[in-house]
């Protein structure tokens, strides 16, 4: 197993309705055409998957069905995109590159990426 | 506890066939690249075969053409097909599995299954 270097912003603001969007990019020594992304939730010291997905290079990242990630991929990098975040889920969410194919078998994990995330406030009522 | 159990092996004549089998830990198989790899007495262990999560393949120029490495997911199961065996893939197989779980990267091996070629 070899090390490679992965890339991804130090904080994220998630938006007003729960999504938060970061690239993670990652240093190929090589042109890989299998690799698996997975995002990983670190908080309070407890590490949790959050999503993952095998892409064959030129091809869009396939996330299950019921995942709350979306991502498009370009080159070495990966817009990951995080949907129905809630206050609560804030926190330092790491991503990890794996370069399966072809061989050497190669594993990066980004330093985080610190989500907050603020739950709107709820509307006033309205006499109108 | 991860555990890879290969079986399969056994003494044959050359020219004939073999399957070896490696049944691993459901937890980690769909996501570990998997390997054959052999020792043979006084050598090294080399890389056989090997297959990722997606399917691809690659084998030591010793093999290509026959041996066939294969894997099934529901079985969390991976497959060595060797066919037209010489005196020289007389080693001790190992089945290797590779990948990551969380943040921590593994790389187990088997116990080994023992074929031998011999007329």
């Known amino acids: 197993c070899k090390a490679m270097h992965v890339a991804q912003p130090a904080v994220v603001l998630a938006s007003s309705r729960g999504i938060a969007s970061f690239v993670c990019e990652y240093a190929s020594p090589g042109k890989a055409t299998e690799v698996r992304v997975t995002v990983l939730r670190q908080a309070d010291s407890q590490v949790t998957e959050v999503c993952a997905a095998t892409y064959m290079m030129g091809n869009e990242l396939t996330f299950l069905d019921d995942s709350i990630c979306t991502g498009t991929s370009s080159g070495n990098q990966v817009n990951l995109t995080i949907q129905g975040l809630r206050a609560m889920d804030t926190g330092l969410y790491i991503c990890k590159v794996e370069l399966m194919y072809p061989p050497p078998y190669y594993l990066g994990i980004g330093n985080g990426t610190q989500i907050y995330v603020i739950d709107p406030e709820p509307c006033p009522d309205s006499d109108f | 506890e991860v555990q890879l159990v290969e079986s399969g092996g056994g003494l044959v004549q050359p020219g004939e066939s073999l399957r070896l089998s490696c049944a691993a830990s459901?937890?980690?198989?769909?996501?570990?690249?998997m390997a054959w790899y052999r020792q043979a007495p006084g050598k090294q262990r080399e890389l056989v075969a090997r297959?990722?999560?997606?399917?691809?393949?690659n084998y030591v120029d010793s093999v290509q053409g026959r041996f066939t490495i294969s894997r099934d997911n529901a079985k969390n199961t991976v497959y060595l097909q060797m066919n037209s065996l010489k005196p020289e893939d007389t080693a001790v197989y190992y089945c290797?599995?590779?990948?990551?779980?969380?943040?921590?990267?593994?790389?187990?091996y088997g116990q080994g299954t023992q074929v031998t070629v011999s007329s």
């Open positions: 290797n599995a590779q990948g990551s779980l969380l943040l921590a990267k593994y790389d187990y």
């Open positions: 459901k937890s980690i198989f769909s996501i570990s690249v």
């Open positions: 297959i990722t999560p997606g399917g691809n393949t």
